[in-house]
Amino acid sequence: MAVTACQGLGFVVSLIGIAGIIAATCMDQWSTQDLYNNPVTAVFNYQGLWRSCVRESSGFTECRGYFTLLGLPAMLQAVRALMIVGIVLGAIGLLVSIFALKCIRIGSMEDSAKANMTLTSGIMFIVSGLCAIAGVSVFANMLVTNFWMSTANMYTGMGGMVQTVQTRYTFGAALFVGWVAGGLTLIGGVMMCIACRGLAPEETNYKAVSYHASGHSVAYKPGGFKASTGFGSNTKNKKIYDGGARTEDEVQSYPSKHDYV
């Protein structure tokens, strides 16, 4: 029950996180005109990953897309790439995790397969969250650098009384949405990985017959050959041939890679 709850919560948290990452990527307010200690203008500038906008005090808003690829700063391109990779990984992770949910039964899918899928989606969510956090952080760093550069030469004298004012940009709402969304996706991914351990069968990888020193604890698993087909009600039974070979549901048996996550 706890495993199902952890998995379900992980899925929901990741879903919210990825929705947030998508929203942040699409938002225009990655950087907004700094209003503090600036001459008050009747025009407000803000910029996103894909276009820059100007809102006049009247309410009129005009946005212009960045219709160039080569002319854009490499950092902006890198941020775009990180956010898109985050979205793609997150979307695939969501798709995988839907089938991995314990509460959803798809055919005769083994718990071990679900555990595998849960782990895969968890890792995808973690990477997706990290991509979003990295993208937003790179952009934020770029803003901070530009902010202090523009502050240094905010007012540049141009022959006597004529002055030019440089517009400074500060953190926009999209950055905070991105950070929170990336964090949620990351947390959701971790929850999925934790849930994966609970989903994995904790049984020992038995051979057909196991001899113990005490002499009276023979563990024999009947019905092995019947189970080898993979169909029928006793799908938990192990194959008794091929020594160390394991069925799909045995993949989680100790020692397993999932114990080292």
Epitope: T41, A42, V43, C53, V54, S58, V162, Q163, V165
Partner: antibody
Amino acid sequence: EVQLVESGGGLIQPGGSLRLSCAASGFSLTTYGVHWVRQAPGKGLEWVSVIWAGGSTNYNSALMSRFTISRDNSKNTLYLQMNSLRAEDTAVYYCARAAYYGNGLDYWGQGTLVTVSS
Amino acid sequence: DIVMTQSPDSLAVSLGERATINCKSSQTLLNSGNQKNYLTWYQQKPGQPPKLLIYWASTGESGVPDRFSGSGSGTDFTLTISSLQAEDVAVYYCQNAYFYPFTFGGGTKLEIK
């Protein structure tokens, strides 16, 4: 048709107060910003204040302490409360609608004359 | 506050001739975000309220004759009347529509020579 009609002007003694009104029709004050601009006899235009559609206000820094702009959305009417009036406040006061583009003033009222004199 | 300086104070031009009015601002009125100059031109005829002619320094208001045109960028702007008509006799004002408080130039009185 867009119309702006100012009222409330007249003769007032120095130090007195006056409230000007601007009745707007043909548009809503919650959709467009409205400015007050004044013009002293034989002089140029001087911007006084603005109230934007969202309700935010801006003032001429020299007049800010004495003048207050407000509006009544239900009456679609704009107001300019003027306190501690001085002789130099004598002017024709215009209300003008803010254009949707470019922050210009596209429709103007005929103005109301305020005379501050003892 | 932004200082708007108009020149000349008055101008006499023959009918059909070109009239040019200049306006200079103490700070740039160019917004880097959209590369638009927030300068507006008005015409005020005697006994009338001002009339909006040009916004964004060069965009004509609808209904304004084509002979009126605006140019310039940053701090220096020009209003040009390509062929002066009798009805163009008025006082012309430029206005900073970028920084608060919005400020007007002193005005240029245009007369017929």
